[in-house]
Interface confidence: low
Amino acid sequence: YDFTNCDFEKIKAAYLSTISKDLITYMSGTKSTEFNNTVSCSNRPHCLTEIQSLTFNPTAGCASLAKEMFAMKTKAALAIWCPGYSETQINATQAMKKRRKRKVTTNKCLEQVSQLQGLWRRFNRPLLKQQ
């Protein structure tokens, strides 16, 4: 999917208001210096491409992120603010009901979510510093 035509400001607002807090909750108890950021992105469409990949594509050692609250909200934001991203716009409340309780958080998953936090920070990078 080409994220060029997304409403970046609306996605940014969704991240700041809720997704960021869910990521922090997931990472609670983990030192911020524990993982090095090895994934980066160079513009907003590129960031969303990397965020989608890390959030929804299963990887070795971490297959379960798509069921997490931050993932559900990410999917909802992309469905709503990226034209054609999803045929059916996901309702966040329905997504919450479907969510399975996470039993085990592997170190690999923590590392992956740490990378996601970095990607989201890059996505929200200011054009110009606020005075």
């Epitope: 160079s42 590129h46 110009l128």
Partner: antibody
Framework: QMQLVESGGGVVQPGRSLRLSCAAS????????MHWVRQAPGKGLEWVAV????????HYADSVKGRFTITRDNSKNTLNLQMNSLRAEDTAVYYC???????????????WGQGTMVTVSS | SYVLTQPPSVSVAPGETATITCGGN??????VHWYQQKPGQAPVLVIY???DRPDRIPERFSGSNSGNTATLTISRVEAGDEADYYC???????????FGGGTKLTVL
């Protein structure tokens, strides 16, 4: 390994044209803004031009506007600088430079080529 | 267009702290980047976004930016730090990248 390699420099007479190329490898070229920066012998750095990651916009230093054209081919991972109506003051080392390119802004230059020398002389 | 002003030269003894300034009108509102260039070599990014350090750049290099002046600080200066240093900003008003004139750091 990430690399930028410039080519096309040389000696050219005033008023003539020259085309510089830059081959990129080892990174996702199509996601980066690309710039040309030049440095006259014994002088400081001078920004020349930028092209957005998707080629949708270009901007030029006042000193080259209307004479130089920056283009890119994302399918071939190449950046070009077409230089027309060359002047003696265009004599410099020309660097091809990568910059993470943000939603309508440009960032720090995190990867530089080694440069190619352009000499404009009669 | 936007102008960045740097001192032409700064001298410092080994082990001391070097401070290189970059002046610009309300530069504190811009994100400032710094480059090191040694003779015959391409420039290298040493500080980006005012104060962030790329990988492989020693912690001795730091940056700050407020008001009308951005500053590059090199603590415990070594002979290998001798080089030209350039500050840089992106001018959003003109869509131009702007470099300072450069500062030659001499290690005595």
């Amino acid at each position: 390994q990430m690399q930028l390699v410039e080519s096309g420099g040389g000696v050219v007479q005033p008023g003539r044209s020259l085309r510089l190329s830059c081959a990129a490898s080892g990174f996702a070229f199509r996601t980066y803004g690309m710039h040309w920066v030049r440095q006259a012998p014994g002088k400081g750095l001078e920004w020349v031009a930028v092209i957005w990651y998707d080629g949708s916009a270009t901007h030029y230093a006042d000193s080259v506007k209307g004479r130089f054209t920056i283009t890119r081919d994302n399918s071939k991972n190449t950046l070009n600088l077409q230089m027309n109506s060359l002047r003696a003051e265009d004599t410099a080392v020309y660097y091809c430079v990568r910059a993470p390119q943000w939603y309508l802004s440009a960032e720090a230059f995190d990867l530089w080529g080694q440069g190619t020398m352009v000499t404009v002389s009669s | 267009s936007y102008v960045l002003t740097q001192p032409p030269s700064v001298s410092v003894a080994p082990g001391e702290t070097a401070t290189i300034t970059c002046g610009g009108n309300l530069i504190g509102a811009y994100l400032v980047h710094w480059y090191q260039q040694k003779p015959g070599q391409a420039p290298v990014l040493v500080i980006y976004d005012d104060s962030d350090r790329p990988d492989r750049i020693p912690e001795r290099f730091s940056g700050s930016n407020s008001g009308n002046t951005a500053t590059l600080t090199i603590s415990r200066v070594e002979a290998g730090d001798e080089a030209d240093y350039y500050c840089q900003v992106w001018d959003h008003n003109t869509n131009h990248m702007v470099f300072g004139g450069g500062t030659k750091l001499t290690v005595l």
